[in-house]
């Protein structure tokens, strides 16, 4: 999916009002310096591409974050503010339901959510100096 035509300001507002708090709740008890930055993004569409990938694609050691509160709110925000996003996700959602396993918060998932926090921060940050 090409995130170029999303309403970035509306997505930013959704992040600031709820998603950020849900991410903090998920990471509670974890030091902010515990994980190094291993993923970045270079513009808002790129950030959303990486956020979608980390949030909804199963990875080794972290089978699924998709049922977490922050993930469901992320999905809702993208569905509302990114034209045509919902249609592209129907098949992926059906496949995910079949794969669903019991919820376990592993260290790998914590690391992945830490990376998500970094991506969201980059998505929201203004470029302080244009240089």
């Amino acid at each position: 999916y090409d995130f170029t035509n999303c309403d970035f300001e509306k997505i930013k507002a959704a992040y600031l009002s709820t998603i950020s708090k849900d991410l903090i709740t998920y990471m509670s008890g974890t030091k902010s310096t515990e994980f190094n930055n291993t993923v970045s993004c270079s513009n808002r569409p790129h950030c959303l591409t990486e956020i979608q990938s980390l949030t909804f694609n199963p990875t080794a050691g972290c089978a699924s974050l998709a049922k977490e509160m922050f993930a469901m709110k992320t999905k809702a925000a993208l569905a509302i503010w990114c034209p045509g996003y919902s249609e592209t996700q129907i098949n992926a959602t059906q496949a995910m339901k079949k794969r669903r396993k019991r919820k376990v918060t592993t260290n790998k998932c914590l690391e992945q959510v830490s990376q998500l926090q970094g991506l969201w921060r980059r998505f929201n940050r203004p470029l302080l100096k244009q240089q």
Partner: antibody, heavy 122, light 108 residues
């Protein structure tokens, strides 16, 4: 463990070519801008070239423009530097390094390889 | 092209504060990054975006930037701080990374 490992350095005659490679591991390579920086013996750091995270944008130092070519293969997590028409003044340790980028601004060079030595001599 | 000017050398007594400057035309409008390089080793990022510090760098390292001068401050200097220090910016005008000439810090 985030790591950058350079290879391909060696001794080469003036006018000849050499290809440097940099293998990245421990981070999502395709999301970072990648640079080559060199350091001549006893001298300071000199930036050589940068390639954007997607490979769409490339910039070179004036001293190497037209002779060096930077490329990346995101499927293999590798960065390359093709060096043609080498000169004695290209003799240096060549470092591969990464930086986050935002639009067309490259941020701090936060991870560096250990470097590979290139000697141009007849 | 944009030029960054550093003093070739700076000395500090153990336990005292060292300040390394980096001069450039209106450098305050740039994000300045600082690197430490010990002999035979690759550079290491010690301060980024003027004053932020990677998590693995001690709080003794700090930075500031305004006007035509950026400054790296190393408080409570130690023998292990002896190294070359480089400032760096990205110039969007020339689309180049620019390094200062480097400053050799000696802990007396």
């Amino acid at each position: 463990q985030m790591q950058l490992v350079e290879s391909g350095g060696g001794v080469v005659q003036p006018g000849r070519s050499l290809r440097l490679s940099c293998a990245a591991s421990g981070f999502t390579f395709r999301t970072y801008g990648m640079h080559w920086v060199r350091q001549a013996p006893g001298k300071g750091l000199e930036w050589v070239a940068v390639i954007s995270y997607s490979g769409s944008y490339i910039h070179y130092a004036d001293s190497v423009k037209g002779r060096f070519t930077i490329t990346r293969d995101n499927s293999k997590n590798t960065l390359n530097l093709q060096m043609n028409s080498l000169r004695a003044e290209d003799t240096a340790v060549y470092y591969c390094t990464r930086s986050p980028q935002w639009e067309e601004v490259y941020e701090a060079l936060d991870i560096w390889g250990q470097g590979t030595m290139v000697t141009v001599s007849s | 092209s944009y030029v960054l000017t550093q003093p070739p050398s700076v000395s500090v007594a153990p336990g005292q504060t060292a300040r390394i400057t980096c001069g450039g035309n209106n450098i305050g409008s740039f994000s300045v990054h600082w690197y430490q390089q010990k002999p035979g080793q690759a550079p290491v990022l010690v301060v980024y975006d003027d004053s932020d510090r990677p998590s693995w760098i001690p709080e003794r390292f700090s930075g500031s930037n305004s006007g035509n001068t950026a400054t790296l401050t190393i408080s409570r200097g130690e023998a292990g701080d002896e190294a070359d220090y480089y400032c760096q910016v990205w110039s969007s005008t020339s689309r180049h990374v620019v390094f200062g000439g480097g400053t050799k810090l000696t802990v007396l």
